[in-house]
């Protein structure tokens, strides 16, 4: 909980308040919503951070609500329920009692139901594609120094070990990042792949969670790349448990976002 | 030395509001925070909720939320709470205290509501 | 909510005597917990914060211990100031939330 203590704030999430009575009296950052205080030095978790946003002001909220049966992905945002550690619940319920099962980056992963519902566990994505297309340029960018560059805002951003990028694939104008963790692999003070997606993809919306840094300015050899089109999958190491009807409509966990 | 004073005793009619300040002294007011505790006669402590005075960013205990509004005035370094729609059981001490383990704490200030 | 419980409600000891006092969290809330005494009468005042770490002006038998769940208040050897009402506090999370106090009265 030790963060740029001569100012007291948090370099790796703006979501939070920051005051200089942690423990030893060293500076502690709360995430606004939950006040749990987190890791400055590390990212949040997303869970923190879905709840910080949902108890964020809210500026534009008298426009309609289209149907919950609208086939338009609602970038995930919910208020959830955090465990004391700042990890999604197995379980998430709303204000009407629905609730639903989760995986760990917080993508419902079972049919709604009500309080009754059991979610044994919370079920590991470990492998997550983001899928990107990037706006028009001059000609495709070099494979290599693509990958190579990706890899390196992976590390350096956002501090993910670089054995957990597993590959990247680039058909013009296509690019996908695959990114995989095990359980098993993931030791402590390791960052989750989930909470990396959750900030790259903050990021390429021009929504950077990190204080006081500017947004992210992706450049391969210097061409800027830019972002037109991002679709994330999550896949989770037990299948999800959708009724055959939903099955045959989706199949992958998906965030849509353009 | 840290100092929280606060006002003095109040009595309000139920249905009515009542503003309780507490002036805060001998340190950076914007970067602590400020709690607001209660005390009913002869009870426990019950936490109302916090406000971080540079931002004025509060956190409502949900059983106050309705009725209890927090604010802060960093020019005069000093918080304040307004309790709304005011009732019997709301009768206590209405304490502040600063930093998140209530390090330093005001001398109370008295609410009674009665008919 | 987090909940803290404390034991015993009510303690009877002479002075000399070693207290201890107890408080359970709901959940693992690392040593986020803090310890008050209040007399009557008075404003509570901080004795113990984040579960270990003693506070300047604070009489060096009052310790506190623990991590988790489970958290303790000892005082070494009683003196007749220290009969009065404790209670503790945790800053894990919003809401914060204390204990429901333990009296140490005189045996």
């Known amino acids: 909980h030790t963060a740029a203590q001569d100012n007291c704030t948090c370099p790796t999430n703006k979501m939070t308040v920051c005051s200089p009575d942690g423990p030893g009296g060293r500076c502690q950052c709360r995430a606004l919503g939950s006040g749990m205080a987190v890791d400055c030095s590390t990212l949040t978790s997303k869970c923190l951070l879905l709840k910080a946003r949902m108890s964020a002001p809210k500026n534009a909220r008298t426009l309609v609500r289209p149907s919950e049966h609208a086939l338009v992905d609602n970038d995930g945002l919910y208020d959830p329920d955090c465990d004391p550690e700042g990890r999604f619940k197995a379980r998430q319920c709303n204000q009407t009692s629905v609730c639903w099962c989760v995986n760990s980056v917080g993508v419902r992963r079972t049919d709604k139901g009500d309080l009754s519902l059991r979610c044994d566990e919370l079920v590991r994505t470990h492998h997550i594609l983001i899928d990107l297309r990037h706006r028009p340029t001059a000609g495709a960018f070099n494979h290599s120094d693509l990958d190579a560059e990706l890899r390196r805002l992976f590390r350096e951003r956002y501090r993910l070990h670089p054995k957990f990028v597993a590959a990247v694939h680039y058909e013009q104008p296509t690019i996908q990042i695959e990114l995989r963790q095990n359980t098993s692999q993931k030791a402590a003070g390791d960052v989750d792949i989930g909470d990396a997606a959750y900030y790259f993809e903050r990021d390429i919306k021009g929504e950077s969670l990190f204080q006081g840094r500017g947004g992210l300015d992706l450049r391969v050899r210097g061409e800027p790349l830019q972002v037109e089109r991002t679709l994330i999958y999550y896949l989770d190491e037990i299948p999800p448990k959708f009724s055959m009807k939903r099955l045959t409509h989706h199949h992958h966990h998906h965030h849509h976002h353009h | 030395q840290v100092q929280l004073v606060q006002s003095g005793a109040e009595v309000k009619k139920p249905g009515a509001s009542v503003k309780v300040s507490c002036k805060a002294s001998g340190y950076s007011f914007t970067t602590h925070w400020i709690h607001w505790v209660r005390q009913a006669p002869g009870q426990g402590l019950e936490w109302i909720g916090t406000?971080?005075?540079?931002?004025?960013?509060?956190v409502y205990n949900q059983k106050f939320r309705d009725r209890a509004t927090m604010t802060a005035d960093t020019s005069i370094s000093t918080a304040y709470i307004e309790l709304s729609r005011l009732r019997s059981d709301d009768t206590a001490v209405y304490y502040c205290a600063r930093a998140s383990y209530f390090d330093y704490w005001g001398q109370g200030t008295t609410v009674t509501v009665s008919s | 909510e987090i909940v803290l419980t404390q034991s015993p409600a009510t303690l009877s000891l002479s002075p000399g005597e070693r207290a201890t006092l107890s408080c359970r969290a709901s959940q693992n809330i690392g040593t986020s917990i803090h310890w008050f005494q209040q007399k009557p009468g008075q404003s509570p005042r901080l004795l113990i914060k984040?579960?270990?770490e003693s506070i300047s002006g604070i009489p060096s038998r009052f310790s506190g211990s623990g991590s988790g769940t489970d958290f303790t208040l000892t005082i070494s050897s009683l003196e007749p100031e220290d009969f009065a009402v404790y209670y503790c506090?945790?800053?894990?999370?919003?809401?914060?939330?204390f204990g429901q106090g333990t009296k140490l009265e005189i045996k």
């Open positions: 506090q945790h800053s894990h999370s919003w809401p914060f939330t």
């Open positions: 406000i971080f005075p540079s931002n004025a960013y509060a």
């Open positions: 984040y579960a270990s």
